[in-house]
């Protein structure tokens, strides 16, 4: 009948604007870690970041400088 | 939606390990830098470790430095935290974190005698 | 070590206006240490307000937003309500832009 027509079309936009949000939702949550994530620089198209380089490079430099105080680069120069 | 939910949680002693657990859905787990943050009773929040997307790169709080690690398992949605010579001031609710963006609910971890 | 600074403790009368800073014992919060704020409510899990010094997280209102105010990141509450008496962290980077992370010790905030 024209009246159960109109209820399932009504039930089906419902349902399609429900599906639509729950999508656009779980987009921008989805998205929002990872957009916070490159807009920092840590993330390139889902590999690490340089910056993780620089970070390895310095633990690796400050262990080697670590092991003998003698060698340890002084930070102020006599005058 | 992002849920990330710790377990792992428990009552050990002194000098014990612990290995801490989040399982993480609701986005692209892989693409993303993961952190752990703790809270003692009572207390701020301290940022403990992270790690990067491959899991090659690892951060520590100089407080944790050599007892805790942290890893991950790209495969299986789950982020870890083993901690090995716990100490009372180790106690604290442990969350798991997309890099200080989403948030866990926390698990307890107890370090007593 | 890098000590993160905030107030203890604020008021705000409700309809009111409050801004909550977060500064560092040495050096400025600048834009690349990428400043964030986090609410804490008796009992929850901290939850994000703002990240990358001034985005705001979803879902949370625009009566939140952060800045750089001199050498401080900054979050403004603009017509404060009963509800939003909790306490505020900030944190930021400090390893270039990346870890490690530290965080403020915090802020107690009262809506009165």
């Known amino acids: 009948s024209e009246a159960e027509d109109a209820s399932l079309l009504s039930f089906m936009q419902g349902y399609m604007k429900h599906a639509t949000k729950t999508a656009k939702d779980a987009l921008s949550s989805v998205q929002e870690s990872q957009v916070a994530q490159q807009a920092r620089g840590w993330v390139t198209d889902g590999f690490s970041s340089l910056k993780d380089y620089w970070s390895t490079v310095k633990d690796k430099f400050s262990e080697f400088w670590d092991l003998d105080p003698e060698v340890r680069p002084t930070s102020a120069v006599a005058a | 939606e992002v849920q990330l939910v710790e377990s792992g949680g428990d009552l050990v002693q002194p000098g014990g390990s612990l290995r801490v657990s989040c399982a993480a859905s609701?986005?692209?787990?892989?693409?993303?830098?993961m952190s752990w943050v703790r809270q003692a009773p009572g207390k701020g929040l301290e940022w403990v470790s992270a790690i990067n997307t491959a899991g090659t790169v690892t951060y520590y709080a100089d407080s944790v430095k050599g007892r805790f690690t942290i890893s991950r398992d790209n495969a299986k949605n789950t982020l870890y935290l083993q901690m090995n010579s716990l100490k009372p001031e180790d106690t604290a609710h442990y969350y798991c974190t997309t890099g200080e963006v989403d948030w866990g609910k926390g698990t307890l971890v107890t370090v007593s005698s | 070590q890098t000590v993160v600074t905030q107030e203890p403790s604020l008021s705000v009368s409700p309809g009111g206006t409050v801004t909550l800073t977060c500064g560092l014992s040495s050096g400025s919060v600048t834009s690349v240490t990428y400043p964030g704020w986090y609410q804490q409510k008796p009992g929850q899990a901290p939850r994000t307000l703002i990240y990358?010094?001034?985005s705001r997280f979803s879902g949370v209102p625009n009566r939140f937003s952060g800045s750089i105010s001199g050498n401080k990141a900054a979050l403004t509450i603009t017509g404060a309500l009963p509800e939003d008496e909790a306490d505020y962290y900030c944190s930021v980077y400090i390893g270039g832009g990346i870890y490690p992370a530290v965080f403020g010790g915090g802020t107690h905030l009262t809506v009165l």
């Open positions: 990358n010094t001034n």
């Open positions: 609701g986005l692209t787990f892989s693409n993303i830098y």
